[in-house]
Structures are given as structure tokens and as C-alpha cells.
């Protein structure tokens, strides 16, 4: 029988250039008579153009919604009602070709053509893109607050904030022809729920979304976004009502930056330089294509690419890469943003070199990508360490912490977290190495203690990059490094002359001179520790709530013992900078560390002194008695303590803690506590120090109070941020 043909709406968006008209400011105001009259004429022309082609039978509706420079650019959308079976045949490319063909056919014609009555349309300036009904609805919702801006070369244009009576606004941005637009977004409030979406075209086409940002992101207080060309749209959707703009937008045209380079690497290991997407740290643009060719000096070496918060993964099937496509020696990989470091190691088999391509496969982009490149020895990629095949990183082997996600760095260890005697593979305690007393059968633990040794998991690396065998040699009063660097920066970790946490005891003045009280409006919120003249370390989760993210809220007290009174040794500071670890993840508590820069340097006294920071190789032995201090609640759910409390706890093996907490303990965590559970850190101690005393009498920072199940609960441990796991970031910031 007869079957009615199913018709579907196909939506197109686009722009065309009119050569015999000029753009004027009047055309930016939708309420102006110039705008109304120009849109009426342009709309008529557009309809006539479409209906002049074989698309005419499918024509449904159209609208010209905006104008721009060039001499005059019209921005429009139209809908065709087409039979379902013809849908794929009328792609934007086909529709564009039909319209261009029509325009070309009448360029030199003397016959009267309706759509040419008023306008001379440039066939080369016609652009047709795929759109959707949803896109048109989104566009229409912004038209009450539609701003067009043209930004000239060399100009930086600050955009006028949104109209707060509107719920949505659109900035339509245009720049000079062969340039690309760079948009800068700076969040100015600590908290908001506003949403901004940036598009690579004049309107909010979902398929051309570059990125969308939401709610005064603290992770990205400043975002720079690149369009692929000279046109861009930004759509704002209102969050909470606010009289202040929660953001500042500015735009500038920039020249296309070539992303091609040929490099020859030197005959040395480690990082030799940086490759990055154009205008890094700006988001890479939707049509980025980079090609880097690196030549390796010898087949002994492989090429290493070290990424920061970005990894490469094999993509199943042939799905597009949503966060950048990489091809390395004909292998296709997809980029993936992660809160971890990552390295890609490329074995070199031919002297021809290696070509690395990076492409943005879709319009959706992300933060610019930067990669450090260098060489590694193919026969020994990680001297003294273990190559983790999961992430390409060199990690300490057999130190009792599973640094590699698959745990292989802790497998097949003869001596785990201990020293292996040469004579008979006996495993002895690390503090017994180079302590002046032979513990191995023939004294191999006391050999090579005065000379450089190959670097390994527990060796200390001196400033001159040589390593010493003695574990934890820092600040013990005896220079072990040739350059004496193990005894530098040692004005730390000494208690003042001085004579609660759950099950704790009250501390005396000067007993814990590095202890900090982090306060908001006179209320103690978190603990912390002084680590340098202008730096206090604490837990990142103290700033988890948006309302706590602003530096102006915080006051840091040092030398404090009692919360309800002040004494002469006490000093207070404002915070000039607050830095959370870039890999901090709220849900998992991983990398739970933050640094506060004080507004002025501390003046050291008996009551105010920094704690010592451990080297990455510093080993805190399971079973070691250490101390936690703070003003946290004295019982679960209780009020904070008035007096600074102290309690000794014992360090616990990582795997035992990991079992108890069902494998949620990462390599950046450390566990301590008592089975009795009465002595443990509690709410309000967050960020406070876990310190361990070295044989030298100096106190080293082992951890920061991070999380745990309840408070002093039997059979559960307190979990701390492991300082040795984040020390490289701390040193990078502080120095």
C-alpha cells in the first residue's frame, strides 16, 4: 500500500559575505531600525538563494540573526525539510557546494536574479555548517543579550560583562581574516555557578564547542582558549544571582604559530627541552596539527616524553580521540588528562629519527599540552630504580610502597625496605647501614660509606648529583656528600627549650615550634607546619569548599599553644599565595597537600622554627614512633581543643594499611596509629604535622594529617600525606 514518506528537519548554520555593503555599529544593536531593515533584506536574499537551487523544494524556514565585518558578513541559520532517505546526501558540504554553484552561475549573468537585487554575495565567503534544533533554541535564548565585537590586530579587547537581568548572553567575536582569536577568561570570585561555553563558530553549535567551563574553577583560575580562526562565540548561562561579574573576558587576535620542529638531541640523559602546543598554556585550537621530528644520537638511547597530568592510551576501535590524537612511529594513541605524571618511552631502532604528530581530531579541545623530551639508556632505563610499564615512570623499587599501579615494583624483592647484605643476602634494618657498626656477616653494610655509590632507592642524592650509601644522612652533623650538601639547609627541626589530640597530652611552648594554626575569622580550621621562612604546608582538603578558597580569608598563627589566649611568642600572618598540589583529587584524597606563602618572612625564635623536610629517599621505617600535634577534637564529634595536643603514634607498613582501607591507600599516603585507637588525629588536625625524630635529634616532617575512618577507632589507622611522595613539588614551589 501507499506509505507516506518520512520527512526530517535538517538544520544548517552559516555565514556569507556581502561585497557591496559595509558593516556599521548600528547593526550590532538588534533594536535599531538599521538592524531590522538589514535583516529583512538579508533574510529575503537568503530565502531566494536557497529556493533558486534544487534545495528549494525542501525549504522550511530561515533566519539572519547577526552581522559582522568583512565588508558585511551575515550570520544565519535555515531548516530544510527533507526525506529521511536523502538525509545523508544533503550534508553541509553538499548544501554549501549547491549554493556556491548557484552563486557562481550568476556572477557574470546579466539576467535579473532575485537574490542579487540588493546584495553582491561573495561565493568564496559562503560557509555552511551542520546544526540542530537544540542549537537554534540555544542561540535564540541568547538573542536578548547578544554582543558582537570586532577586535583588530594588535588589540586586546576587554568584553563588557553579561547583562544580569538576562539568563544567557552571547558574545560574537570576530578578528582579522588570517588570524586566530585567543580568548582569556579570568574568574574573579571564589564561588559562582556561572557557565561559559566557547565555540569555534559564530553561534552555539554543539558540534563546534571548543570547551565549556563552570563555576569559578579554582583548578583553572585563568583559562585561555584559542579558536581555529578569526571567529568565535562565547555563551554565558547565569548561575547564582550576583551584582558582580564573576569573570573577566578579553580577546585578542594572534598569528598562527607553526607547530613543526626538527631537533637533534645531545648525547646525554634526562630532559633536554620542551615541546608544546601553540600559545601554551592556552588551550590548543580545534585545528591544531603539530609535527615534531627528533633525531637521536645513537641507538643506545630511547626517546622519553615526560607529560604532566596527561597520558597517552591506545584507543580501542577507531573512535576519535577527544583529548588529542598522537601518532608516534605510526602508532596511534589518544591523549587523556589525568591527575598523575606520565612518561611515554619510545624505543629507537633506526637512526632516521622519530616523528611525533599531535592533532586535535574534534573541535572540543583542552588545556595546552607540554611535554619534556629527553633520552634514556635502552639497556638500563631506570638506573637504581624500577621502570613502571603502566606509566613509563622510574619508581623506587622494593621500598615497601607500591608506586607502580600494578605493584610490580614491590615484587621479587630479596630485601624489601631493608638493606641487602652482599655476603648472604641477609636483609638488615636501613638505619644500621653506615652506622659505624658492622651488622652484615663481613661488614658489607659499612663498606663504601665515605665514597660515592650508584644511586638507588635509599641512597641520598647530593647536589652534585652523586649519591651516598648512608640512608637519611641529612642534617646529622656529619658531611657525607663530597659537596657537603647533606648538611645544608639544616636550620630546622629543633625544638625550643621547653620542658589534645585523642589520648594526647598538652604541649608546652616551643615544643613544636613549626606548628601552625590556620584560622578563618578567628576560628581554628586546620593545622599546618612551617617549612621555610615564608612557607607553611598543610592539607589541600582544608580548602575543598569554594568558600574557603580565597587567600584573604586565612590567617596563619605560629608559636601558638593556646587557642583562647595569646602569649608573647605568638605571631600571625596573612596569606599572599595558596597553592594546591596540581594532582590533588578530592574524592581519593590523593596528593593532599597545599602550600601557603606568608605575607612576610618569619623571624625565627624559640617558639617559631621550621621543621626539616625529608629528601625523596628518606626512609621512615614501619614501627617508628612519631608524633602528631594539633588542636583537633579530643573525641569524635567533639569541640576542638584549647591547648595544643601531642601524641605518639607508630608508622604502619603500607600494605597492611592498604588492606585495612580496601586498597584506597595510594603511594602518596602514609599510615600511623595504635590498635587501641585512643591516640589518633581528629577533625581540626587536618593538615597538621606528623613528625619523626632522627638520631641527630632533629625532627623531620613525615606526613600531614589527611584522612581516616572516624577518630581513634580501634583497628583503623590515621592516613597522612606522605611527604616524600610530594617533596619534589614542594621543593619546586619553595625554591
Amino acid at each position: 500500500g501507499y506509505k507516506a514518506e518520512v520527512m526530517v528537519s535538517q538544520v544548517y548554520s552559516g555565514s556569507l559575505r556581502v561585497l557591496n555593503r559595509h558593516f556599521s555599529q548600528d547593526l550590532t544593536r538588534r533594536e535599531s531600525s538599521a538592524f531590522r531593515s538589514e535583516t529583512a533584506k538579508a533574510q529575503k536574499m537568503l530565502k531566494e538563494l536557497i529556493t533558486s537551487t534544487r534545495l528549494g523544494t525542501y525549504y522550511n524556514s530561515s533566519s539572519v540573526y547577526s552581522f559582522g565585518e568583512g565588508p558585511l558578513t551575515c550570520f544565519f541559520w535555515f531548516i530544510l525539510q527533507i526525506p529521511e532517505h536523502r538525509r545523508l546526501m544533503l550534508s553541509p558540504e553538499v548544501v554549501q557546494a549547491l549554493l556556491v554553484e548557484e552563486l557562481l552561475s550568476t556572477v557574470n549573468s546579466s539576467a535579473a536574479v532575485p537574490y542579487r537585487a540588493e546584495y553582491e554575495v561573495d561565493p568564496e565567503g559562503l560557509v555552511i555548517l551542520e546544526a540542530s534544533v537544540k542549537d537554534i533554541a540555544a542561540l535564540n535564548s541568547t538573542l536578548g543579550c547578544y554582543r558582537y565585537s570586532y577586535v583588530g590586530q594588535g588589540q586586546v579587547l576587554r568584553l563588557k560583562g553579561p547583562d544580569h537581568l538576562a539568563s544567557s548572553c552571547l558574545w560574537h567575536l570576530q578578528g582579522p581574516k588570517d588570524l586566530m582569536l585567543k580568548l582569556r577568561l579570568e574568574w574573579t570570585l571564589a564561588e559562582c555557578r556561572d557557565r561559559l561555553a566557547m565555540y569555534d563558530v559564530a553561534g552555539p553549535l554543539e558540534k563546534r564547542l571548543i570547551t565549556s567551563v563552570y563555576g569559578c574553577s579554582r583548578q583553572e583560575p585563568v583559562v585561555e582558549v584559542l579558536a581555529s580562526g578569526a571567529i568565535m562565540a562565547v555563551v554565558w548561562k547565569k548561575g547564582l544571582h550576583s551584582y558582580y561579574d564573576p569573570f573577566v573576558l578579553s580577546v585578542q587576535p594572534v598569528v598562527f604559530q607553526a607547530c613543526e620542529v626538527n631537533l637533534t638531541l645531545d648525547n646525554r640523559l634526562d630532559s633536554q627541552g620542551v615541546l608544546s602546543t601553540p600559545y601554551f598554556p592556552s588551550y590548543y585550537s580545534p585545528q591544531t596539527h603539530c609535527s615534531w621530528h627528533l633525531t637521536v644520537p645513537s641507538l643506545d638511547y630511547g626517546l622519553a616524553l615526560w607529560f604532566d597530568a596527561y597520558a597517552l592510551r591506545r584507543q580501542k576501535y577507531d573512535l576519535p580521540c577527544t583529548q588529542g590524537q598522537w601518532t608516534i612511529q605510526n602508532r596511534r594513541l589518544c591523549g587523556l588528562r589525568i591527575l598523575q605524571p606520565y612518561a611515554e618511552r619510545i624505543p629507537v631502532v633506526a637512526t632516521a629519527g622519530i616523528t611525533i604528530n599531535f592533532t586535535s581530531q574534534i573541535s572540543l579541545t583542552g588545556p595546552g599540552v607540554r611535554v619534556h623530551y629527553g633520552l634514556y639508556n635502552q639497556s638500563d632505563p631506570c638506573p637504581g630504580e624500577f621502570l613502571c610499564s603502566v606509566n613509563g615512570l622510574c619508581v623506587p623499587a622494593c621500598d615497601g610502597v607500591k608506586d607502580c599501579p600494578n605493584g610490580l615494583d614491590e615484587r621479587n624483592c630479596v630485601c624489601r625496605a631493608t638493606f641487602q647484605c652482599k655476603e648472604d643476602s641477609t636483609c638488615i634494618s636501613l638505619p644500621k647501614v653506615c652506622d659505624g657498626q658492622p651488622d652484615c656477616l663481613n661488614g658489607s653494610d659499612e663498606e663504601q660509606c665515605q665514597e660515592g655509590v650508584p644511586c638507588g632507592t635509599f641512597t641520598f642524592q647530593c647536589e652534585d648529583r652523586s649519591c651516598v650509601k648512608k640512608p637519611n644522612p641529612q642534617c646529622d652533623g656529619r658531611p657525607d656528600c663530597r659537596d657537603g650538601s647533606d648538611e645544608e639547609h639544616c636550620d630546622c627541626g629543633l625544638q625550643g627549650p621547653s620542658s589534645r589530640i585523642v589520648g594526647g597530652a598538652v604541649s608546652s611552648e616551643g615544643e613544636w615550634p613549626w606548628q601552625a594554626s590556620l584560622q578563618v575569622r578567628g576560628r581554628h580550621i586546620c593545622g599546618g607546619a612551617l617549612i621555610a621562612d615564608r612557607w607553611v604546608i598543610t592539607a589541600a582538603h582544608c580548602f575543598q569548599e569554594d568558600s574557603m578558597a580565597s587567600t584573604v580569608l586565612w590567617t596563619v598563627f605560629l608559636g601558638k599553644v593556646w587557642q583562647n589566649s595569646r602569649w608573647p611568642g605568638e605571631v600571625s600572618f596573612k596569606v599572599s599565595r595558596l597553592l594546591l598540589h596540581p594532582y590533588h583529587e578530592e574524592d581519593s584524597h590523593d596528593y593532599d597537600v597545599a602550600l601557603l606563602q606568608l605575607d612576610h618572612p618569619v623571624v625565627r625564635s624559640a617558639a617559631v622554627r621550621p621543621v626539616c623536610l625529608p629528601a625523596r629517599s628518606h626512609f621512615f621505617e614501619p614501627g617508628l614512633h612519631c608524633w602528631i600535634t594539633g588542636w583537633g577534637a579530643l573525641r569524635e564529634g567533639g569541640p576542638i581543643s584549647n591547648a595544643l595536643q601531642k601524641v605518639d603514634v607508630q608508622l604502619i607498613p603500607q600494605d597492611l594499611c592498604s588492606e585495612v582501607y580496601r586498597y584506597q591507600v595510594t603511594p602518596r599516603m602514609l599510615c600511623a596509629g595504635y590498635r587501641k585507637g585512643k591516640k589518633d588525629a581528629c577533625q581540626g588536625d587536618s593538615g597538621g604535622p606528623l613528625v619523626c625524630k632522627a638520631l641527630s635529634g632533629r625532627w623531620f616532617l613525615a606526613g600531614l594529617v589527611s584522612w581516616g575512618l572516624g577518630c581513634g577507632r580501634p583497628n583503623y589507622f590515621g592516613v597522612y600525606t606522605r611527604i616524600t611522595g610530594v617533596i619534589s613539588w614542594i621543593q619546586q614551589v619553595v625554591t
Epitope: 631493608t418 644500621k432 621505617e621 614501619p622 614501627g623 607508630q650 597492611l656 587501641k676 589507622f717
Partner: antibody, heavy 120, light 107 residues
């Protein structure tokens, strides 16, 4: 000085119960766990269970679950271990020990032991 | 439960000898191993915990070593008062378990 003093030897018939006491001095028993470990003649050591005298929370080795009850009286600093349904293989020296208060348990002080003989 | 297998079950040695007793755990116990000394008719005495740490008052001739699943107690120079039975214990996870013991006798 830390001391754990246990009650004297006992002779019991099969099926009966025995209750051994352990008086602590030189420390506060609320701050530690009190464990019980037994040793059959010429045999090794076998952990039976423990109590937290502060809140009477106890834990038992699966082998003794249901037959052993450990209690404590903090007013007298005394812990007790009762073993029921005695059989001849329960003949052993029973020790009370102080478990180090840390999360992992080793036994730093021991009572002198109480010999329990189960015989018909 | 974690099994602790001690060896040898007995050994004969002379005063001044270096003696080593070993203990193997059925799984990795991360250095959570204690050693005890027991003399006939007496209660055991704690010598070493956390594999290496000597308990208060224990002479320095007693030392512990090991990692993972394999642990050892060494008496560097055997003294007359050291003739006794020695036990290892894992303090990694409940139920706390002991090795079968090693009897050190005079040769």
C-alpha cells in the same frame, strides 16, 4: 615495675570450665590490651584472644570462638579468661600477656603462667 | 591465618658461636615479626619486634633481619644464658601466630 600475676594451677574434669585471673600492676590496664596465650606441654605458643579493658571489647582466635570468654575488671586491674567445655587437649600452661598498645600486637610483658590440667 | 614456619626445630652450639634461626611466613608480613626467648618453666620474654628493634634491656648480641616472608634471629656470640627455646611471631594481622620454636642446646 610492670607485672602480671596469675592465679594458681587448676585441675578440671572434661566438660567443665576454668576461669584464670591475671592482676596487673605498674601500668594502667585501660591503656593496653590483655591477651591470653597458651602452651601445651612441650608444644608451641597459641594465641587465644584479647580484651580491651577500657570498653570490654574482645576478639578471639577462630579456634576458640564460642568456648573462651575474656573479661576485665578495671577497678581491680584484673583480667580473666574462662574456657568452657574442657577436653584433655586443653591441658596447657595459660599465660596472660600485655599487648603493646600499637596497632600491631607483640607481647612485651607476660604473666608467670597458670597450669590447667584436664583429666578424668 | 598466617602460618609461621620456624627452622631448625633444634640446634646444638657452643658458647661464642654465631647462631641463626629462621622463620618463614606464609605471606608477606612487612617486617612485622617479633622474637621471644623462653626458658624451661618460665614465661616467654620479648627480644625483638618489627623484625629489627631490640626490646628494652636486650643485649646487642641479639639481632633481627629479614623482609617480606623470610626473617631471622641471630645471636652473634652465644652466651651460657642464651640456651633456651626461641619463637617467632607475626604481628602483622590477627590472629597473631607463632612459629613452632627452635631449641638451642649446648653442644
Amino acid at each position: 615495675e610492670v607485672q602480671l600475676v596469675q592465679s594458681g594451677a587448676e585441675v578440671k574434669k572434661p566438660g567443665a570450665s576454668v576461669k584464670v585471673s591475671c592482676k596487673a600492676s605498674g601500668f594502667n590496664i585501660k591503656d593496653y590490651y590483655i591477651h591470653w596465650v597458651r602452651q601445651a606441654t612441650g608444644q608451641g605458643l597459641e594465641w587465644m584472644g584479647r580484651i580491651d579493658p577500657e570498653d570490654a571489647e574482645s576478639e578471639y582466635a577462630p579456634k576458640f570462638q564460642g568456648r573462651v570468654t575474656i573479661t576485665a575488671d578495671t577497678s581491680t586491674d584484673t583480667a580473666y579468661m574462662e574456657l568452657s567445655s574442657l577436653r584433655s587437649e586443653d591441658t596447657a600452661v595459660y599465660y596472660c600477656t600485655r599487648g603493646d598498645s600499637m596497632m600491631v600486637t607483640y607481647f612485651d610483658y607476660w604473666g608467670q603462667g597458670t597450669l590447667v590440667t584436664v583429666s578424668s | 591465618d598466617i602460618q609461621m614456619t620456624q627452622s631448625p626445630s633444634s640446634l646444638s652450639a657452643s658458647v661464642g658461636d654465631r647462631v641463626t634461626i629462621t622463620c618463614k611466613a606464609s605471606q608477606d608480613v612487612s617486617t612485622a615479626v617479633a622474637w621471644y626467648q623462653q626458658k624451661p618453666g618460665k614465661a616467654p620474654k620479648l627480644l625483638i619486634y618489627w623484625a629489627f628493634t631490640r626490646h628494652t634491656g636486650v643485649p646487642s648480641r641479639f639481632s633481627g633481619s629479614g623482609s617480606g616472608t623470610d626473617y631471622a634471629l641471630t645471636i652473634s656470640s652465644l652466651q651460657p644464658e642464651d640456651f633456651a627455646t626461641y619463637y617467632c611471631q607475626q604481628h602483622y594481622r590477627s590472629p597473631w601466630t607463632f612459629g613452632g620454636g627452635t631449641k638451642v642446646e649446648i653442644k
